[in-house]
């Protein structure tokens, strides 16, 4: 806390220029006034302040304007964005993404701090949903951003964003958020032509339900063994042995190698060891001949 | 935070000259406007000069006025302040902070000058 002094004699700042490194904290706290640093904040992103002095200015700032900032002072805070607190954050009301985007670049290469997730909270929460550009910014910025949203939040993103989303955007989701994922890119990709579209859902395969496994193993796709590897079990399960084959097409060798890994393994159990025979990949651990399989689950729906 | 290395410091006679040197660790320094402080014990930091990232652009503090100069070679990602006519009262720890693209900052840990 700078102490209250009066400002000496020719010292007062007209403007925002680099004379005012050469100002004590003291001086600026008392040669600068609030309302033109304000108006010319885009000028402090190019004074190469002191940290110290930067607090100078922000103590500034929060005077006259306690109740949160403008988005006109807002969009030039640079790196005194990164001295603000969430608590500040939420005083605010973002609306433009330019103002996002230049918030953004200040944090860039470095993990998404609380300021930045307050401030993502604020805009998106602002918008009412997470619309294409939106998510084009965040995704750009921050790959795994989408994965740290949760089902809730995820629902709030329309089909037409999913274009906007790259694979490895999908790298670090759960089951759940695929889940909810999985139905808007389906609706988002419908027109493609099949290989296009086996292109652009593969990545959200994980929330995929065993009926659309079985129409893609229709489709000559060939999914690489990454994919199957994180499809949902439960909707690998049902699969045939035929229908896996056809799925993963020449990667259907790599069963081999991932038979002790779920899916696979849990997949293998539920299969007829004469089918899984049939591949040729000395996979173990089916059904023995002569076995009656009963499906406990539906027993129990018919009691 | 990003970071900035400062070199060229010593103890050097009164009248005497030091080139300090000022480099980024970790990145580029080039669209970096540059500013040269000090901090002498018991003292607050102040500033000394400052230059522009292209380096059209200089400012000097009174005290050091027509004894030191600010100065930039891109080519090799350096600011310098050569410091002539050095005096006692020049001691100092000195520093350099900068600013660059969407107001992006770094500073140093600083280089010590004894003038005696």
């Known amino acids: 806390e700078v102490e209250k002094t009066a400002c000496p004699s020719g010292k007062k700042a007209r403007e925002i220029d680099e004379s005012l490194i050469f100002y004590k904290k003291w001086e600026l706290e008392a040669c600068v006034d609030a309302a033109l640093l304000a108006t010319q904040m885009d000028r402090v992103n190019a004074i190469p302040f002191t940290y110290e002095q930067l607090d100078v200015l922000k103590h500034k700032l929060d005077e006259l304007y306690p109740q949160g900032y403008p988005e006109s002072v807002i969009q030039h805070l640079g790196y005194l964005f990164l001295k603000m607190s969430p608590e500040d954050i939420r005083k605010w009301n973002v609306t433009s993404l330019e103002t996002l985007k230049a918030l953004l670049e200040v944090n860039k290469g470095h993990e998404m701090s609380p300021q930045v997730a307050t401030l993502i909270d604020r805009f998106v929460k602002g918008r009412g949903q997470l619309d294409k550009d939106t998510l084009d910014t965040l995704t750009a910025f921050y790959p795994g951003y989408l994965c740290s949203l949760s089902p809730e939040e995820l629902s709030s993103v329309p089909p037409s964003s999913i274009w906007a989303v790259r694979p490895q955007d999908l790298d670090t989701c759960d089951p759940r958020q695929l889940d909810v994922l999985y139905p808007k890119a389906r609706l988002a990709f419908q027109n493609m032509n099949g290989s296009e579209y086996f292109v652009k859902i593969q990545s959200f395969l994980g929330g995929a339900p065993t009926e659309d496994l079985k129409a893609l193993s229709q489709q000559n796709v060939s999914m690489d063994l990454a994919t199957f590897m994180k499809l949902r079990t439960d909707a690998v399960l049902p699969l045939t042995v035929a229908e896996v084959q056809k799925l993963l097409g020449p990667h259907v060798e790599g069963l081999k190698a991932e038979e002790r890994h779920r899916p696979v393994r849990d997949w293998i159990l539920r299969q007829r060891q004469d089918d899984l025979d049939t591949l040729g990949l000395g996979l173990q651990g089916g059904i023995p001949n002569g076995y009656l399989v009963l499906d406990l689950s539906m027993q129990e729906a018919l009691s | 935070q990003l970071q900035l290395v400062e070199s060229g410091g010593g103890l050097v006679q009164p009248g005497g000259s030091l080139r300090l040197s000022c480099a980024a660790s970790g990145f580029t320094l080039d669209n970096y406007a540059i500013g040269w402080f000090r901090q002498a014990p018991g003292k607050e930091r102040e500033g000394v000069s400052s230059?522009?990232?292209?380096?059209?652009?200089?400012n000097y503090a009174d005290s050091v006025k027509g004894r030191f100069t600010v100065s930039r070679d891109n080519a090799k990602h350096t600011v310098y302040l050569q410091m002539n006519s050095l005096k006692p009262e020049d001691t100092a720890v000195y520093y350099c902070a900068g600013v660059g693209d969407y107001g992006r900052r770094a500073m140093g840990q600083g280089t010590s000058v004894t003038v005696s």
């Open positions: 230059i522009s990232s292209s380096g059209g652009s200089t």
